[in-house]
């Protein structure tokens, strides 16, 4: 509970041993008490003891003094704990009873009799001081005292403030009498859970987890966290803010790792060389003549600089060199000549000119020779002037380049085209490749140089049905079927059923005209197909052997733009306003002979040459379909009609339009 009402019984006097009803107790009144504590009532009434009730064991007979007892049976003062905010007012009923029965639990015994009772009503503040009282009636007297105190960890005027002292992660405090927290030394905050850091610990840079501590945040150090830590890579530097690297005197670089006084500190340069504090390593050595190496530690041969002139030979000596001069020369470097033009000193046709009144001479050398006496042959190939692997050859006053096959020019800088000598026969198109020329042949020819003529009779296989007559087209692979009466189709494969009463003459005339027109169209198509047709085995080889106007009509893969989710290829015709068809399925069967492109051509009845659109495909696309427009195929030089082969997923159809 939050508090306890305590009642201390001190003395009870019943000298005559009488009960409240006037009877006397035999042999004496064995007395116990019942206490009822309830909310304040102006007139005490029966009913529940709202604040609590308690009974005692038999405390004595007739008159007796009650001693304090802290535990066990007969505890005194009596404890009435409550678990609510103490209201400050109360009603208390104390009854004295006689029991003929058990001493320890008399309230349960039958035959108990009331001796006397007192009622106290009033106000009582929480506190440790006892309020003492004495009640008398005609027969008895009771001395007692009482108070209200708060239970452990409850504080305040009404015992409503809970405070439990603690010293752990959640707080470090004791409780004041009013229930407020009193922080233990070194702790602060509303719940005394914030340590008081070491005095002077930097507010931003430092913190602490226990009193008198100063833990630094990243980048700071020192007792009070007021000094920064330099950058991880810093070598000879300090900082004014964390992770900085401000170089100490004499050091430079991003991480202060370059010694600006390396020469002074390390003296790296040897053999009297000059040291300067520069360069990637922080120093550079400038060597004296005759020395080399990063630190001038390597001594050069004294003769390394070829000091002897005019063919003199050099000999190394301990600290210098000596020149052995050829006849006619003298001086430290054989620089002086004893010869004159009279001695004919100029070789290889050099002409001699006298100098210094004839005491010396100078040779004027012809091309290809040099030296003071024209004794040295000029090597004009030292600069590697020949390109593309050509071999340089000194030839008299000049040099020539001997070129590898396929190259020409004074420096072998020009590439000779293998196609320059026109190796392809019968109008084959030549292509320069690394391994030599490759010919792409026109229709009707094959072979490495298009030298083989292909002979093939398109009618030999008997392609026409129902007794139709077969005519070979202009191209060896093309044919036209002339159908007998009653049959139609590119191969005359479809019978025509006619009603009996039919205007035969008119129809025959009409059909004849149609057939003639179809034949005419097919012949023209055949002429075109002559250029377009290629057998499967030649298609790859012949693909580029197109005439000029055919080349104009090529559509490279780059011009075929797929703009449709259904994998259809759309071709843009640009300035030419012709209509054209869609090219579906990413392949074009460009080898269909005109004879195979009649209405209702049956799938599977003709050889396929599926040509990937990745290669240049000669298209003659010209249809009445509005789905796409075709450009880059209509050559101004191409006066022939154009046709479009539509390869759709449902059926194959060829729509042909002619241009006159």
């Amino acid at each position: 509970g939050s508090g306890i009402f305590q009642l201390r019984l001190q003395e009870f006097v019943n000298q005559r041993g009488m009960l409240a009803n006037g009877q006397s107790c035999e042999p004496g009144c064995r007395t116990f008490f019942r206490i009822c504590l309830k909310h304040f009532q102006a007139t005490f009434s029966e009913g529940p003891c709202t604040f609590g009730n308690v009974s005692t064991p038999v405390l004595g007979t007739n008159s007796f003094v009650v001693r304090d007892k802290n535990s066990g049976s007969g505890r005194n003062p009596l404890q009435l704990p409550f678990n609510f905010t103490w209201p400050g007012t109360f009603s208390l009923n104390i009854q004295a009873w006689h029991t003929p029965g058990d001493d320890l639990r008399p309230e349960t015994s039958p035959g108990n009799s009331l001796i006397s009772q007192i009622i106290i009503q009033g106000s009582l503040a929480v506190g440790k001081i006892w309020r003492t009282d004495e009640q008398n009636d005609t027969l008895t007297r009771l001395s007692y005292s009482y108070r209200v105190i708060c239970s452990d960890n409850y504080y305040g005027e009404s015992c409503s403030r809970l405070c439990k002292k603690r010293d752990d992660h959640f707080g470090h405090y004791e409780c004041q009498p009013d229930g407020s927290l009193s922080c233990l030394p070194g702790w602060t905050g509303k719940y005394c859970d914030q340590p008081i850091c070491l005095s002077g610990c930097h507010e931003q840079n430092g913190y602490c987890s226990k009193p008198d501590e100063c833990i630094c945040r990243p980048g700071w150090q020192g007792r009070l966290c007021n000094e920064c830590i330099p950058h991880n890579g810093c070598r000879h530097g300090t900082c004014s803010i964390p992770w900085q690297c401000a170089c100490d005197e004499g050091w430079g670089g991003l991480f202060c790792d370059q010694d600006l006084n390396y020469c002074t500190h390390h003296s790296p340069c040897k053999n009297g060389s000059t040291c300067s504090n520069s360069g990637p390593k922080g120093y550079t050595c400038t060597c004296l003549p005759g020395y080399t190496g990063e630190h001038c530690e390597l001594g050069l041969s004294k003769c390394a600089s070829n000091p002897c002139r005019n063919g003199g030979s050099c000999k190394d000596q301990e600290n210098s060199y000596h020149c052995l001069c050829p006849p006619g020369y003298y001086g430290q470097h054989c620089e002086h000549s004893t010869l004159t033009c009279a001695d004919s000193p100029c070789f290889n046709g050099g002409s001699c000119r006298e100098r210094n009144q004839g005491s010396s001479y100078a040779c004027e050398c012809p091309p290809n020779f040099t030296g003071s006496n024209c004794e040295k042959k000029v090597d004009r190939c030292t600069s590697n002037p020949c390109a593309n692997g050509g071999q340089c050859q000194n030839r008299g006053p000049s040099r020539t380049c001997r070129c590898r096959p396929g190259f020409t020019g004074t420096h072998c800088e020009l590439h000779i085209s293998d196609c320059a000598r026109s190796p392809c026969a019968h109008g084959g198109t030549c292509h320069d490749l690394e391994n030599g020329p490759v010919c792409t042949c026109p229709a009707g020819f094959s072979g490495r140089r298009c030298e083989v003529r292909i002979t093939h009779d398109a009618c030999a296989s008997g392609p026409c049905f129902n007794g139709a007559t077969c005519y070979t087209g202009l191209s060896p692979n093309n044919f036209v079927c002339n159908c007998p009466y009653g049959f139609v189709g590119s191969r005359c494969e479809f019978p025509v059923g006619l009603p009996p009463s039919f205007p035969w003459v008119a129809v025959s005339l009409g059909v004849g005209l149609v057939v003639l027109l179809v034949l005419l169209v097919m012949v023209v198509v055949a002429v075109r197909q002559l250029r377009l047709r290629r057998p499967d085995d030649e298609s790859r080889e012949a693909m580029n052997n197109l005439s000029d106007f055919q080349k104009d009509n090529l559509i490279p893969a780059a011009q075929l733009k797929n703009t449709n989710q259904k994998k259809e290829l759309e071709v843009d015709c640009g300035l030419d306003k012709s209509n054209c068809g869609k090219l579906q399925n990413h392949t074009l069967d460009y080898n269909l002979a005109p004879g195979l492109l009649g209405r209702g051509g049956m799938p599977g009845k003709y050889p396929h040459s599926d040509k990937s659109l990745g290669e240049k495909v000669p298209l003659r696309l010209h249809s009445e379909k509005p789905e796409c427009r075709i450009s880059a195929i209509c050559s101004p030089r191409d006066s022939m009609y154009q046709s479009v082969c539509l390869i759709s997923e449902e059926r194959n159809e060829c729509v042909i339009a002619t241009e006159v």
Partner: antibody, heavy 118, light 107 residues
């Protein structure tokens, strides 16, 4: 080139003492905080102690507090770890490292093995 | 103390592989995290600091990322010299703590 060279490791009985040294070169020793980090055989890394560069403030892991003392001699560019009341659980390779408890350990020595065994 | 948990504890991979090692802190460490590489019998070497900054002289195939409690070390294309044990370390809170390590082995 930054170099940290530890010495002083060895075999010692429980309750015994050992003093580890670390000679630093290749950087201005007095400018940087230093630390000791240890690694028990086949185990992970464990920070042991740190000393600041400025005022020599020291910090220790709880398990070595009162037994180990970290110190430095800026004039000699040296770091030390005095280890007293050694226990079997202190057995490890001890690395000298440049860094604080709140910064990365940028450079490490080759380590010195301390074995505490009876 | 902040607990650092690395995963996996061991990992087999081949030269040229892309490898990822993760490190989880028991509370937010605000990017104050480093990665170290240690080869057998050698001392650790700093690879990455502040979660994603490459230490001086470390090849660019190493990279770090993460925030809050989770961090990652990535090796974009394993080289023979990369087979070693890798440790993460937080230095946001006192005391500094290391992960238990991830051993990267040749498959």
């Amino acid at each position: 080139e930054v170099q940290l060279v530890e010495s002083g490791g060895g075999l010692v009985q429980p309750g015994g003492s050992l003093r580890l040294s670390c000679a630093a070169s290749g950087f201005t020793f007095s400018n940087f905080p230093m630390a000791w980090v240890r690694q028990a055989p086949g185990k992970g890394l464990e920070w042991v102690a740190t000393i600041s560069s400025s005022d020599g403030t020291t910090y220790y892991r709880d398990s070595v507090k009162g037994r180990f003392t970290i110190s430095r001699d800026n004039a000699k560019s040296s770091l030390y770890l005095q280890m007293n009341s050694l226990r079997a659980e202190d057995t490890a390779v001890y690395y000298c490292s440049r860094g604080y408890y709140n910064s990365p350990f940028a450079y490490w020595g080759q380590g010195t093995l301390v074995t505490v065994s009876s | 103390d902040i607990q650092m948990t690395q995963s996996p504890s061991s990992l087999s991979a081949s030269v040229g592989d892309r490898v990822t090692i993760t490190c989880r802190a028991s509370e937010d460490i605000y990017s104050n995290l480093a990665w170290y590489q240690q080869k057998p019998g050698k001392s650790p070497k700093l690879l990455i600091f502040d979660t994603n900054n490459l230490a001086d002289g470390v090849p660019s195939r190493f990279s770090g990322s993460g925030s809050g409690t989770d961090s990652t070390l990535t090796i974009s294309s394993l080289q023979p010299e990369d087979f070693a044990t890798y440790f993460c370390q937080q230095y946001n809170n006192y005391p500094p703590t290391f992960g238990q390590g991830t051993k990267l082995e040749i498959k």
